[in-house]
Amino acid sequence: SGVFQLQLQEFINERGVLASGRPCEPGCRTFFRVCLKHFQAVVSPGPCTFGTVSTPVLGTNSFAVRDDSSGGGRNPLQLPFNFTWPGTFSLIIEAWHAPGDDLRPEALPPDALISKIAIQGSLAVGQNWLLDEQTSTLTRLRYSYRVICSDNYYGDNCSRLCKKRNDHFGHYVCQPDGNLSCLPGWTGEYCQQPICLSGCHEQNGYCSKPAECLCRPGWQGRLCNECIPHNGCRHGTCSTPWQCTCDEGWGGLFCDQDLNYCTHHSPCKNGATCSNSGQRSYTCTCRPGYTGVDCELELSECDSNPCRNGGSCKDQEDGYHCLCPPGYYGLHCEHSTLSCADSPCFNGGSCRERNQGANYACECPPNFTGSNCEKKVDRCTSNPCANGGQCLNRGPSRMCRCRPGFTGTYCELHVSDCARNPCAHGGTCHDLENGLMCTCPAGFSGRRCEVRTSIDACASSPCFNRATCYTDLSTDTFVCNCPYGFVGSRCEFPVGLPPSFPW
Protein backbone atom coordinates (compact mmCIF):
# COMPACT_ATOMS: atom_id res chain seq x y z
CA SER A 1 0.00 0.00 0.00
CA GLY A 2 1.41 3.42 -0.97
CA VAL A 3 0.90 6.69 -2.82
CA PHE A 4 2.12 7.92 -6.22
CA GLN A 5 2.63 11.69 -5.81
CA LEU A 6 2.71 14.11 -8.78
CA GLN A 7 3.79 17.72 -8.22
CA LEU A 8 2.84 20.11 -11.08
CA GLN A 9 5.26 23.04 -11.11
CA GLU A 10 4.85 25.15 -14.25
CA PHE A 11 2.75 25.16 -17.43
CA ILE A 12 3.66 27.39 -20.38
CA ASN A 13 1.09 28.14 -23.19
CA GLU A 14 2.33 31.54 -24.38
CA ARG A 15 -0.05 31.84 -27.30
CA GLY A 16 -3.06 30.64 -25.33
CA VAL A 17 -4.12 28.06 -27.90
CA LEU A 18 -5.78 24.62 -27.90
CA ALA A 19 -4.21 21.45 -29.34
CA SER A 20 -6.19 22.16 -32.53
CA GLY A 21 -4.41 25.55 -32.83
CA ARG A 22 -7.62 27.49 -32.14
CA PRO A 23 -7.15 30.24 -29.51
CA CYS A 24 -9.05 30.13 -26.20
CA GLU A 25 -11.48 32.97 -25.57
CA PRO A 26 -10.57 35.07 -23.62
CA GLY A 27 -7.67 32.81 -22.44
CA CYS A 28 -7.06 29.07 -21.73
CA ARG A 29 -8.50 28.38 -18.23
CA THR A 30 -6.35 25.31 -17.66
CA PHE A 31 -6.97 22.20 -15.49
CA PHE A 32 -5.31 18.77 -15.61
CA ARG A 33 -6.39 15.17 -15.72
CA VAL A 34 -3.91 12.44 -14.67
CA CYS A 35 -4.06 8.72 -15.44
CA LEU A 36 -1.69 6.23 -13.74
CA LYS A 37 -1.59 2.67 -15.01
CA HIS A 38 0.55 -0.45 -15.35
CA PHE A 39 3.66 -0.37 -17.54
CA GLN A 40 2.97 -0.41 -21.29
CA ALA A 41 5.79 -0.41 -23.83
CA VAL A 42 3.55 1.85 -25.91
CA VAL A 43 1.18 3.83 -23.70
CA SER A 44 -2.30 3.22 -25.06
CA PRO A 45 -5.88 4.16 -24.12
CA GLY A 46 -7.67 1.99 -21.61
CA PRO A 47 -8.50 1.76 -17.93
CA CYS A 48 -6.27 3.65 -15.47
CA THR A 49 -5.50 0.49 -13.47
CA PHE A 50 -3.48 2.35 -10.81
CA GLY A 51 -5.86 5.33 -10.45
CA THR A 52 -6.93 8.73 -11.76
CA VAL A 53 -7.10 12.28 -10.41
CA SER A 54 -8.32 15.66 -11.72
CA THR A 55 -7.39 19.19 -10.63
CA PRO A 56 -9.54 22.32 -10.50
CA VAL A 57 -8.61 25.20 -12.85
CA LEU A 58 -5.06 26.10 -11.80
CA GLY A 59 -4.35 29.11 -14.04
CA THR A 60 -4.75 30.79 -17.45
CA ASN A 61 -2.37 30.20 -20.37
CA SER A 62 1.05 30.21 -18.63
CA PHE A 63 1.37 29.90 -14.86
CA ALA A 64 3.37 28.38 -11.99
CA VAL A 65 1.51 25.94 -9.72
CA ARG A 66 2.07 26.65 -6.06
CA ASP A 67 2.61 23.88 -3.53
CA ASP A 68 -0.80 23.54 -1.90
CA SER A 69 -0.15 20.40 0.17
CA SER A 70 -0.95 22.24 3.42
CA GLY A 71 -4.30 23.54 2.15
CA GLY A 72 -6.16 20.40 1.18
CA GLY A 73 -3.49 18.35 -0.56
CA ARG A 74 -4.19 19.34 -4.20
CA ASN A 75 -0.54 19.73 -5.14
CA PRO A 76 1.21 17.35 -5.05
CA LEU A 77 -1.58 15.22 -6.50
CA GLN A 78 -2.14 11.93 -4.61
CA LEU A 79 -2.76 8.60 -6.37
CA PRO A 80 -3.02 5.94 -3.63
CA PHE A 81 -2.72 2.19 -4.37
CA ASN A 82 -3.36 -0.83 -2.11
CA PHE A 83 -1.13 -3.39 -3.78
CA THR A 84 2.57 -4.17 -4.02
CA TRP A 85 4.27 -1.42 -6.07
CA PRO A 86 5.50 -3.21 -9.22
CA GLY A 87 8.42 -0.81 -9.84
CA THR A 88 7.17 0.24 -13.32
CA PHE A 89 4.33 2.48 -14.46
CA SER A 90 2.71 4.47 -17.29
CA LEU A 91 1.59 8.10 -16.72
CA ILE A 92 -0.69 10.24 -18.88
CA ILE A 93 -1.11 13.97 -18.09
CA GLU A 94 -3.69 15.99 -20.05
CA ALA A 95 -4.14 19.77 -19.92
CA TRP A 96 -7.73 20.89 -20.68
CA HIS A 97 -9.44 24.24 -21.22
CA ALA A 98 -12.58 24.84 -19.11
CA PRO A 99 -14.89 27.33 -20.81
CA GLY A 100 -17.30 27.15 -17.83
CA ASP A 101 -17.35 25.79 -14.25
CA ASP A 102 -18.37 22.21 -15.11
CA LEU A 103 -15.18 20.17 -15.54
CA ARG A 104 -16.83 16.77 -16.14
CA PRO A 105 -15.68 15.09 -19.38
CA GLU A 106 -19.17 15.03 -20.83
CA ALA A 107 -19.59 18.80 -20.17
CA LEU A 108 -16.56 19.81 -22.27
CA PRO A 109 -16.39 20.25 -26.05
CA PRO A 110 -14.23 17.53 -27.64
CA ASP A 111 -11.64 20.05 -28.85
CA ALA A 112 -11.06 21.53 -25.35
CA LEU A 113 -7.81 19.51 -25.03
CA ILE A 114 -4.74 21.80 -24.80
CA SER A 115 -1.99 19.14 -24.59
CA LYS A 116 -1.37 15.52 -23.65
CA ILE A 117 1.88 13.87 -22.51
CA ALA A 118 2.50 10.16 -21.85
CA ILE A 119 5.55 8.67 -20.14
CA GLN A 120 6.45 5.21 -18.86
CA GLY A 121 9.37 3.63 -17.10
CA SER A 122 10.79 2.30 -13.84
CA LEU A 123 10.28 4.02 -10.52
CA ALA A 124 11.59 2.76 -7.18
CA VAL A 125 9.94 3.62 -3.87
CA GLY A 126 11.73 6.55 -2.21
CA GLN A 127 11.53 10.05 -0.76
CA ASN A 128 13.39 11.77 -3.67
CA TRP A 129 11.38 13.59 -6.36
CA LEU A 130 12.14 12.91 -10.05
CA LEU A 131 12.01 16.18 -12.04
CA ASP A 132 10.76 16.03 -15.67
CA GLU A 133 9.87 18.56 -18.38
CA GLN A 134 7.81 17.78 -21.48
CA THR A 135 7.74 20.24 -24.41
CA SER A 136 5.46 20.26 -27.44
CA THR A 137 5.21 22.75 -30.31
CA LEU A 138 2.95 25.09 -28.36
CA THR A 139 3.25 24.12 -24.65
CA ARG A 140 5.74 23.12 -21.96
CA LEU A 141 4.97 21.28 -18.64
CA ARG A 142 7.43 20.98 -15.76
CA TYR A 143 6.55 18.51 -12.99
CA SER A 144 8.12 16.03 -10.54
CA TYR A 145 6.89 12.72 -9.11
CA ARG A 146 7.72 9.98 -6.63
CA VAL A 147 6.25 6.86 -4.91
CA ILE A 148 6.13 6.62 -1.09
CA CYS A 149 4.65 3.96 1.19
CA SER A 150 1.46 4.45 3.21
CA ASP A 151 1.58 4.48 7.00
CA ASN A 152 2.58 1.05 8.40
CA TYR A 153 3.90 -0.16 5.01
CA TYR A 154 7.60 -0.59 4.32
CA GLY A 155 10.11 -2.15 1.96
CA ASP A 156 11.11 -1.75 -1.68
CA ASN A 157 7.54 -2.45 -2.86
CA CYS A 158 5.54 -1.10 0.11
CA SER A 159 4.47 -4.72 0.66
CA ARG A 160 5.74 -5.24 4.18
CA LEU A 161 3.08 -4.45 6.79
CA CYS A 162 4.37 -3.42 10.19
CA LYS A 163 2.35 -1.67 12.90
CA LYS A 164 4.20 -0.64 16.03
CA ARG A 165 2.64 -2.11 19.14
CA ASN A 166 3.19 -2.49 22.85
CA ASP A 167 0.75 -5.16 24.03
CA HIS A 168 0.33 -8.91 24.53
CA PHE A 169 1.16 -9.64 20.87
CA GLY A 170 4.44 -7.73 20.74
CA HIS A 171 6.48 -4.81 22.03
CA TYR A 172 8.21 -3.18 19.07
CA VAL A 173 8.56 -0.27 16.65
CA CYS A 174 9.21 -0.62 12.91
CA GLN A 175 12.55 -0.01 11.21
CA PRO A 176 12.65 1.74 7.80
CA ASP A 177 12.84 -1.64 6.04
CA GLY A 178 9.79 -2.94 7.96
CA ASN A 179 11.76 -5.20 10.28
CA LEU A 180 10.80 -5.12 13.94
CA SER A 181 12.93 -3.31 16.50
CA CYS A 182 12.15 -4.57 20.00
CA LEU A 183 11.43 -2.10 22.77
CA PRO A 184 13.95 -2.20 25.67
CA GLY A 185 13.48 -5.34 27.76
CA TRP A 186 11.87 -7.48 25.02
CA THR A 187 13.23 -10.06 22.58
CA GLY A 188 12.10 -12.81 20.19
CA GLU A 189 10.82 -12.84 16.61
CA TYR A 190 7.84 -10.64 17.51
CA CYS A 191 9.33 -9.10 20.67
CA GLN A 192 6.82 -11.03 22.77
CA GLN A 193 9.43 -12.56 25.04
CA PRO A 194 10.48 -10.48 28.05
CA ILE A 195 14.18 -10.32 28.97
CA CYS A 196 14.25 -11.58 32.55
CA LEU A 197 16.35 -10.19 35.40
CA SER A 198 20.05 -10.66 34.62
CA GLY A 199 21.18 -14.01 36.01
CA CYS A 200 17.65 -15.40 36.39
CA HIS A 201 18.02 -19.20 36.12
CA GLU A 202 17.23 -20.34 32.58
CA GLN A 203 15.18 -23.43 33.53
CA ASN A 204 13.97 -22.68 37.05
CA GLY A 205 13.00 -19.03 36.56
CA TYR A 206 10.81 -17.17 34.07
CA CYS A 207 9.24 -13.74 33.68
CA SER A 208 6.09 -12.17 32.27
CA LYS A 209 7.60 -8.68 32.04
CA PRO A 210 11.17 -7.36 31.68
CA ALA A 211 13.68 -7.43 34.58
CA GLU A 212 11.48 -9.87 36.52
CA CYS A 213 12.47 -13.31 37.85
CA LEU A 214 9.55 -15.50 38.88
CA CYS A 215 10.39 -18.94 40.26
CA ARG A 216 8.90 -22.18 39.02
CA PRO A 217 7.44 -24.50 41.68
CA GLY A 218 10.18 -25.88 43.89
CA TRP A 219 12.63 -22.98 43.46
CA GLN A 220 13.30 -19.79 45.39
CA GLY A 221 15.77 -16.91 45.74
CA ARG A 222 16.25 -13.69 43.79
CA LEU A 223 17.53 -15.63 40.75
CA CYS A 224 15.49 -18.83 41.34
CA ASN A 225 18.67 -20.88 41.78
CA GLU A 226 17.91 -22.24 45.26
CA CYS A 227 15.76 -25.34 45.59
CA ILE A 228 12.94 -25.52 48.15
CA PRO A 229 13.32 -28.63 50.35
CA HIS A 230 10.40 -30.90 51.29
CA ASN A 231 7.92 -29.02 53.47
CA GLY A 232 8.85 -29.78 57.10
CA CYS A 233 12.43 -30.82 56.31
CA ARG A 234 14.29 -30.22 59.61
CA HIS A 235 17.92 -31.38 59.47
CA GLY A 236 18.35 -31.75 55.72
CA THR A 237 19.08 -30.01 52.41
CA CYS A 238 18.09 -30.37 48.75
CA SER A 239 19.77 -30.35 45.33
CA THR A 240 16.45 -30.64 43.43
CA PRO A 241 13.04 -29.41 44.65
CA TRP A 242 11.11 -31.18 47.39
CA GLN A 243 14.10 -33.30 48.38
CA CYS A 244 15.13 -33.71 52.00
CA THR A 245 18.65 -35.13 52.05
CA CYS A 246 19.47 -35.67 55.71
CA ASP A 247 22.47 -34.20 57.45
CA GLU A 248 24.77 -36.77 59.07
CA GLY A 249 23.13 -38.40 62.06
CA TRP A 250 19.53 -37.61 61.05
CA GLY A 251 16.94 -39.75 59.30
CA GLY A 252 13.29 -40.09 58.38
CA LEU A 253 11.18 -38.42 55.67
CA PHE A 254 11.71 -34.97 57.26
CA CYS A 255 15.21 -35.63 58.67
CA ASP A 256 13.74 -35.05 62.11
CA GLN A 257 14.60 -38.47 63.54
CA ASP A 258 17.81 -38.56 65.51
CA LEU A 259 19.95 -41.46 64.30
CA ASN A 260 22.94 -40.42 66.42
CA TYR A 261 21.26 -39.91 69.76
CA CYS A 262 24.36 -41.17 71.55
CA THR A 263 26.61 -38.39 70.23
CA HIS A 264 23.98 -35.63 70.38
CA HIS A 265 22.71 -36.39 73.92
CA SER A 266 25.16 -38.79 75.75
CA PRO A 267 22.28 -40.50 77.61
CA CYS A 268 24.16 -43.48 79.16
CA LYS A 269 25.37 -43.02 82.75
CA ASN A 270 27.99 -44.67 84.96
CA GLY A 271 30.42 -45.46 82.16
CA ALA A 272 27.92 -47.49 80.13
CA THR A 273 28.46 -48.05 76.39
CA CYS A 274 25.90 -46.28 74.14
CA SER A 275 24.69 -47.83 70.85
CA ASN A 276 22.41 -46.02 68.35
CA SER A 277 19.52 -48.35 67.54
CA GLY A 278 17.34 -46.37 65.15
CA GLN A 279 15.18 -43.26 65.05
CA ARG A 280 15.63 -41.34 68.31
CA SER A 281 16.46 -44.61 70.07
CA TYR A 282 19.57 -46.00 71.71
CA THR A 283 20.69 -48.86 73.94
CA CYS A 284 22.92 -48.52 76.98
CA THR A 285 25.12 -51.51 77.80
CA CYS A 286 25.69 -51.19 81.55
CA ARG A 287 28.85 -51.97 83.45
CA PRO A 288 28.43 -54.70 86.09
CA GLY A 289 26.44 -53.48 89.08
CA TYR A 290 24.29 -50.99 87.15
CA THR A 291 20.86 -51.14 85.53
CA GLY A 292 18.10 -48.93 84.17
CA VAL A 293 17.45 -47.66 80.63
CA ASP A 294 20.36 -45.26 81.00
CA CYS A 295 22.32 -47.49 83.52
CA GLU A 296 21.42 -44.89 86.12
CA LEU A 297 20.51 -47.43 88.86
CA GLU A 298 22.88 -49.47 91.02
CA LEU A 299 21.68 -53.04 91.45
CA SER A 300 22.24 -56.24 93.26
CA GLU A 301 23.09 -59.04 90.87
CA CYS A 302 19.63 -60.49 91.30
CA ASP A 303 18.10 -57.27 90.00
CA SER A 304 18.90 -58.35 86.46
CA ASN A 305 16.57 -61.40 86.85
CA PRO A 306 19.21 -63.92 85.79
CA CYS A 307 17.08 -66.92 86.73
CA ARG A 308 14.93 -68.20 83.89
CA ASN A 309 11.77 -70.30 83.71
CA GLY A 310 10.43 -68.95 87.03
CA GLY A 311 13.56 -69.64 89.06
CA SER A 312 14.05 -67.48 92.18
CA CYS A 313 17.29 -65.57 92.80
CA LYS A 314 19.21 -65.46 96.09
CA ASP A 315 21.97 -62.85 96.57
CA GLN A 316 25.28 -64.15 97.87
CA GLU A 317 28.50 -62.36 98.75
CA ASP A 318 30.26 -63.74 95.74
CA GLY A 319 27.32 -63.46 93.36
CA TYR A 320 23.90 -65.08 93.28
CA HIS A 321 22.21 -68.49 93.23
CA CYS A 322 19.07 -69.66 91.34
CA LEU A 323 16.52 -71.92 93.01
CA CYS A 324 14.84 -73.74 90.09
CA PRO A 325 11.16 -74.81 89.96
CA PRO A 326 10.26 -78.43 89.32
CA GLY A 327 11.25 -79.56 85.83
CA TYR A 328 14.19 -77.10 85.38
CA TYR A 329 17.88 -77.14 86.30
CA GLY A 330 21.16 -75.37 85.46
CA LEU A 331 22.98 -72.20 86.66
CA HIS A 332 20.10 -70.05 85.46
CA CYS A 333 17.39 -72.80 85.45
CA GLU A 334 17.83 -72.76 81.69
CA HIS A 335 17.59 -76.51 81.15
CA SER A 336 14.22 -78.29 81.16
CA THR A 337 13.47 -81.70 82.47
CA LEU A 338 10.06 -81.50 80.82
CA SER A 339 9.13 -83.45 77.67
CA CYS A 340 6.27 -83.17 75.18
CA ALA A 341 4.31 -85.44 77.50
CA ASP A 342 4.08 -82.53 79.94
CA SER A 343 2.25 -80.34 77.31
CA PRO A 344 4.64 -77.38 77.74
CA CYS A 345 3.51 -75.38 74.66
CA PHE A 346 0.88 -72.67 75.33
CA ASN A 347 -1.62 -70.91 73.03
CA GLY A 348 -2.05 -73.87 70.68
CA GLY A 349 1.65 -74.37 69.98
CA SER A 350 2.69 -77.83 68.75
CA CYS A 351 5.47 -79.76 70.53
CA ARG A 352 8.39 -81.52 68.77
CA GLU A 353 10.66 -83.87 70.81
CA ARG A 354 14.43 -83.53 70.52
CA ASN A 355 17.42 -85.64 71.61
CA GLN A 356 15.39 -88.83 71.92
CA GLY A 357 12.86 -87.05 74.15
CA ALA A 358 15.42 -85.46 76.48
CA ASN A 359 14.00 -82.05 75.62
CA TYR A 360 11.55 -80.39 73.22
CA ALA A 361 10.85 -77.39 70.96
CA CYS A 362 7.54 -75.55 70.54
CA GLU A 363 6.28 -74.49 67.08
CA CYS A 364 4.07 -71.46 67.73
CA PRO A 365 0.91 -70.37 65.87
CA PRO A 366 0.83 -66.91 64.25
CA ASN A 367 0.77 -64.01 66.71
CA PHE A 368 2.70 -65.95 69.46
CA THR A 369 6.39 -66.45 70.25
CA GLY A 370 8.69 -67.53 73.08
CA SER A 371 10.18 -70.94 73.96
CA ASN A 372 6.74 -72.06 75.16
CA CYS A 373 4.60 -69.79 72.87
CA GLU A 374 3.80 -67.76 75.95
CA LYS A 375 4.40 -64.28 74.39
CA LYS A 376 2.04 -62.38 72.03
CA VAL A 377 3.69 -61.03 68.85
CA ASP A 378 3.67 -57.23 68.31
CA ARG A 379 3.03 -57.08 64.53
CA CYS A 380 4.29 -53.53 64.25
CA THR A 381 7.86 -54.20 65.39
CA SER A 382 9.01 -54.80 61.79
CA ASN A 383 7.69 -51.28 60.83
CA PRO A 384 5.90 -52.53 57.66
CA CYS A 385 4.31 -49.20 56.64
CA ALA A 386 6.09 -47.34 53.81
CA ASN A 387 6.34 -43.58 53.13
CA GLY A 388 6.04 -42.59 56.79
CA GLY A 389 2.77 -44.49 57.43
CA GLN A 390 1.78 -45.20 61.05
CA CYS A 391 1.37 -48.87 62.09
CA LEU A 392 -1.64 -49.77 64.28
CA ASN A 393 -2.21 -53.18 65.94
CA ARG A 394 -5.77 -54.43 65.34
CA GLY A 395 -6.19 -57.73 67.21
CA PRO A 396 -4.63 -60.50 65.12
CA SER A 397 -3.84 -58.15 62.26
CA ARG A 398 -2.23 -54.79 61.68
CA MET A 399 -3.19 -51.66 59.75
CA CYS A 400 -1.25 -48.76 58.19
CA ARG A 401 -2.53 -45.19 58.54
CA CYS A 402 -1.07 -43.35 55.52
CA ARG A 403 0.24 -39.79 55.19
CA PRO A 404 -1.55 -37.46 52.70
CA GLY A 405 -0.57 -38.33 49.13
CA PHE A 406 -0.16 -42.08 49.73
CA THR A 407 -2.47 -45.08 49.75
CA GLY A 408 -2.39 -48.91 49.59
CA THR A 409 -2.22 -51.63 52.29
CA TYR A 410 1.30 -50.54 53.23
CA CYS A 411 1.05 -46.89 52.02
CA GLU A 412 3.24 -47.97 49.09
CA LEU A 413 1.18 -46.21 46.36
CA HIS A 414 1.25 -42.53 45.37
CA VAL A 415 -2.20 -40.94 44.95
CA SER A 416 -2.56 -40.08 41.23
CA ASP A 417 -1.75 -36.43 40.39
CA CYS A 418 -4.04 -36.82 37.37
CA ALA A 419 -7.15 -37.43 39.51
CA ARG A 420 -7.99 -33.71 39.58
CA ASN A 421 -7.95 -33.38 35.71
CA PRO A 422 -5.23 -30.69 35.56
CA CYS A 423 -4.82 -30.62 31.75
CA ALA A 424 -6.87 -27.88 30.03
CA HIS A 425 -8.51 -27.94 26.56
CA GLY A 426 -8.82 -31.75 26.37
CA GLY A 427 -5.13 -32.46 27.09
CA THR A 428 -4.20 -36.04 28.10
CA CYS A 429 -2.70 -36.43 31.61
CA HIS A 430 0.20 -38.85 32.33
CA ASP A 431 1.31 -39.68 35.90
CA LEU A 432 5.09 -39.50 36.36
CA GLU A 433 7.20 -40.46 39.37
CA ASN A 434 7.72 -36.80 40.29
CA GLY A 435 4.47 -35.21 39.14
CA LEU A 436 2.51 -35.27 35.89
CA MET A 437 2.75 -34.38 32.18
CA CYS A 438 0.05 -33.10 29.80
CA THR A 439 -0.08 -34.08 26.10
CA CYS A 440 -1.88 -31.18 24.36
CA PRO A 441 -4.23 -31.28 21.34
CA ALA A 442 -3.46 -29.30 18.17
CA GLY A 443 -3.66 -25.55 18.77
CA PHE A 444 -2.61 -25.67 22.44
CA SER A 445 0.65 -25.78 24.39
CA GLY A 446 2.08 -25.07 27.83
CA ARG A 447 2.62 -27.26 30.93
CA ARG A 448 -1.16 -27.60 31.37
CA CYS A 449 -2.26 -26.99 27.71
CA GLU A 450 -3.38 -23.55 28.86
CA VAL A 451 -1.68 -21.57 26.03
CA ARG A 452 -3.52 -21.12 22.73
CA THR A 453 -1.13 -21.42 19.77
CA SER A 454 -1.61 -21.07 16.05
CA ILE A 455 -2.34 -24.11 13.88
CA ASP A 456 -1.17 -24.94 10.34
CA ALA A 457 -1.47 -21.57 8.65
CA CYS A 458 -3.24 -22.75 5.48
CA ALA A 459 -5.56 -25.19 7.32
CA SER A 460 -8.06 -22.42 7.94
CA SER A 461 -8.36 -21.56 4.21
CA PRO A 462 -7.34 -17.94 4.75
CA CYS A 463 -7.19 -16.98 1.06
CA PHE A 464 -10.28 -15.67 -0.77
CA ASN A 465 -11.40 -15.62 -4.41
CA ARG A 466 -9.85 -19.01 -5.28
CA ALA A 467 -6.34 -17.80 -4.44
CA THR A 468 -3.64 -20.42 -3.77
CA CYS A 469 -2.38 -20.67 -0.17
CA TYR A 470 1.27 -21.46 0.52
CA THR A 471 2.48 -22.22 4.04
CA ASP A 472 5.93 -22.00 5.59
CA LEU A 473 5.73 -24.80 8.17
CA SER A 474 8.88 -23.73 10.01
CA THR A 475 7.45 -20.28 10.81
CA ASP A 476 3.72 -21.16 10.67
CA THR A 477 2.96 -18.38 8.19
CA PHE A 478 1.06 -18.24 4.91
CA VAL A 479 1.12 -16.28 1.64
CA CYS A 480 -1.83 -16.01 -0.77
CA ASN A 481 -1.08 -16.08 -4.50
CA CYS A 482 -3.90 -13.96 -5.98
CA PRO A 483 -5.65 -14.72 -9.27
CA TYR A 484 -5.77 -11.90 -11.85
CA GLY A 485 -8.05 -9.07 -10.73
CA PHE A 486 -7.57 -9.41 -6.94
CA VAL A 487 -5.11 -7.94 -4.45
CA GLY A 488 -4.63 -7.81 -0.67
CA SER A 489 -2.89 -10.04 1.84
CA ARG A 490 -5.71 -12.57 1.40
CA CYS A 491 -6.73 -11.59 -2.16
CA GLU A 492 -9.97 -10.19 -0.77
CA PHE A 493 -9.98 -6.86 -2.65
CA PRO A 494 -10.92 -6.67 -6.35
CA VAL A 495 -8.70 -4.31 -8.37
CA GLY A 496 -10.91 -1.20 -8.57
CA LEU A 497 -11.50 0.20 -12.07
CA PRO A 498 -12.03 4.01 -11.99
CA PRO A 499 -14.66 5.88 -14.04
CA SER A 500 -13.70 5.66 -17.72
CA PHE A 501 -12.29 8.81 -19.30
CA PRO A 502 -12.07 9.47 -23.09
CA TRP A 503 -8.34 9.02 -23.36
Epitope: Y190, G443, R490
Partner: nanobody
Framework: EVQLVESGGGLVQAGGSLRLSCVAS????????MGWFRQAPGKEREFVSS????????NYTDSVKGRFTISKDNAKNMVHLQMNSLKPEDTAVYYC??????????????????WGQGTQVTVSS
Protein backbone atom coordinates in the same frame (compact mmCIF):
# COMPACT_ATOMS: atom_id res chain seq x y z
CA GLU B 1 -8.31 -11.08 23.22
CA VAL B 2 -11.70 -12.01 21.77
CA GLN B 3 -14.23 -14.08 23.77
CA LEU B 4 -16.39 -16.52 21.78
CA VAL B 5 -19.52 -18.40 22.90
CA GLU B 6 -21.12 -21.10 20.71
CA SER B 7 -24.70 -22.42 20.81
CA GLY B 8 -27.06 -24.54 18.71
CA GLY B 9 -25.40 -27.99 18.92
CA GLY B 10 -27.41 -31.14 19.57
CA LEU B 11 -28.58 -34.54 18.32
CA VAL B 12 -30.15 -34.79 14.86
CA GLN B 13 -30.98 -37.60 12.42
CA ALA B 14 -29.05 -38.00 9.17
CA GLY B 15 -30.48 -35.69 6.50
CA GLY B 16 -31.65 -33.19 9.15
CA SER B 17 -30.52 -29.62 9.83
CA LEU B 18 -28.92 -27.62 12.67
CA ARG B 19 -27.97 -23.96 12.98
CA LEU B 20 -24.88 -23.12 15.04
CA SER B 21 -24.33 -19.58 16.33
CA CYS B 22 -21.27 -17.87 17.76
CA VAL B 23 -21.23 -14.47 19.46
CA ALA B 24 -17.97 -12.50 19.75
CA SER B 25 -17.18 -10.01 22.52
CA UNK B 26 -14.06 -8.19 23.68
CA UNK B 27 -11.71 -6.52 21.18
CA UNK B 28 -13.69 -7.38 18.02
CA UNK B 29 -11.88 -4.63 16.07
CA UNK B 30 -8.89 -7.00 15.78
CA UNK B 31 -10.90 -9.77 14.09
CA UNK B 32 -9.93 -10.53 10.49
CA UNK B 33 -12.37 -13.32 9.87
CA MET B 34 -14.45 -15.81 11.87
CA GLY B 35 -15.37 -19.37 11.24
CA TRP B 36 -15.82 -22.93 12.42
CA PHE B 37 -13.49 -25.86 13.01
CA ARG B 38 -14.51 -29.34 14.17
CA GLN B 39 -12.86 -32.23 15.97
CA ALA B 40 -14.17 -35.79 15.87
CA PRO B 41 -13.04 -38.24 18.60
CA GLY B 42 -9.46 -39.36 18.03
CA LYS B 43 -8.96 -37.01 15.04
CA GLU B 44 -7.17 -33.70 14.42
CA ARG B 45 -9.11 -30.46 14.57
CA GLU B 46 -10.10 -29.52 10.97
CA PHE B 47 -11.31 -26.37 9.21
CA VAL B 48 -15.01 -26.26 8.21
CA SER B 49 -15.89 -22.73 7.04
CA SER B 50 -14.99 -19.05 7.50
CA UNK B 51 -16.40 -15.62 6.65
CA UNK B 52 -14.43 -12.40 6.17
CA UNK B 53 -15.27 -9.93 8.99
CA UNK B 54 -15.47 -7.08 6.44
CA UNK B 55 -17.81 -9.04 4.15
CA UNK B 56 -15.24 -9.80 1.44
CA UNK B 57 -16.07 -13.50 1.02
CA UNK B 58 -16.52 -16.98 2.46
CA ASN B 59 -14.58 -20.25 2.40
CA TYR B 60 -15.68 -23.89 2.90
CA THR B 61 -13.87 -27.21 3.13
CA ASP B 62 -14.75 -29.47 0.18
CA SER B 63 -16.79 -32.01 2.21
CA VAL B 64 -19.39 -29.40 3.31
CA LYS B 65 -19.72 -27.29 0.13
CA GLY B 66 -23.38 -27.01 -0.95
CA ARG B 67 -24.65 -28.30 2.42
CA PHE B 68 -23.36 -25.70 4.91
CA THR B 69 -23.81 -21.92 4.70
CA ILE B 70 -21.95 -19.39 6.84
CA SER B 71 -23.36 -15.91 7.46
CA LYS B 72 -22.71 -12.91 9.70
CA ASP B 73 -25.01 -10.67 11.72
CA ASN B 74 -23.07 -7.38 11.86
CA ALA B 75 -25.33 -5.72 14.42
CA LYS B 76 -24.85 -8.49 16.98
CA ASN B 77 -21.22 -9.50 16.22
CA MET B 78 -22.55 -13.00 15.49
CA VAL B 79 -21.68 -15.71 12.97
CA HIS B 80 -24.11 -18.50 12.03
CA LEU B 81 -23.44 -21.87 10.39
CA GLN B 82 -26.56 -23.35 8.75
CA MET B 83 -25.94 -27.09 8.38
CA ASN B 84 -28.31 -28.98 6.04
CA SER B 85 -28.32 -32.59 4.76
CA LEU B 86 -26.26 -33.64 7.81
CA LYS B 87 -24.35 -36.95 7.63
CA PRO B 88 -23.07 -39.22 10.44
CA GLU B 89 -19.51 -38.23 9.50
CA ASP B 90 -20.38 -34.63 10.48
CA THR B 91 -20.51 -35.77 14.13
CA ALA B 92 -17.90 -33.78 16.10
CA VAL B 93 -17.36 -31.00 18.60
CA TYR B 94 -17.69 -27.75 16.60
CA TYR B 95 -15.45 -24.86 17.70
CA CYS B 96 -15.98 -21.23 16.80
CA UNK B 97 -12.70 -19.44 15.94
CA UNK B 98 -11.73 -15.82 15.36
CA UNK B 99 -8.64 -15.10 13.25
CA UNK B 100 -6.45 -12.10 13.98
CA UNK B 101 -3.88 -11.08 11.34
CA UNK B 102 -1.02 -9.54 13.26
CA UNK B 103 2.06 -8.79 11.17
CA UNK B 104 3.68 -9.42 7.81
CA UNK B 105 6.92 -11.41 8.24
CA UNK B 106 9.66 -12.20 5.70
CA UNK B 107 7.94 -15.57 5.03
CA UNK B 108 4.33 -14.35 4.93
CA UNK B 109 1.44 -13.49 7.21
CA UNK B 110 1.17 -14.98 10.69
CA UNK B 111 -2.33 -15.55 12.05
CA UNK B 112 -3.57 -16.19 15.57
CA UNK B 113 -6.80 -17.86 16.66
CA UNK B 114 -9.09 -17.29 19.63
CA TRP B 115 -11.32 -20.30 20.35
CA GLY B 116 -14.72 -20.93 21.87
CA GLN B 117 -15.31 -23.85 24.26
CA GLY B 118 -17.05 -25.96 21.59
CA THR B 119 -20.56 -27.37 21.05
CA GLN B 120 -21.35 -31.06 20.38
CA VAL B 121 -23.11 -32.03 17.13
CA THR B 122 -24.23 -35.67 16.88
CA VAL B 123 -25.76 -37.04 13.67
CA SER B 124 -27.40 -40.47 14.09
CA SER B 125 -28.04 -42.81 11.20
Amino acid sequence: EVQLVESGGGLVQAGGSLRLSCVASGDTSEIYDMGWFRQAPGKEREFVSSIHWGGRGTNYTDSVKGRFTISKDNAKNMVHLQMNSLKPEDTAVYYCAATRLIVYTPTGFRQYFDWGQGTQVTVSS
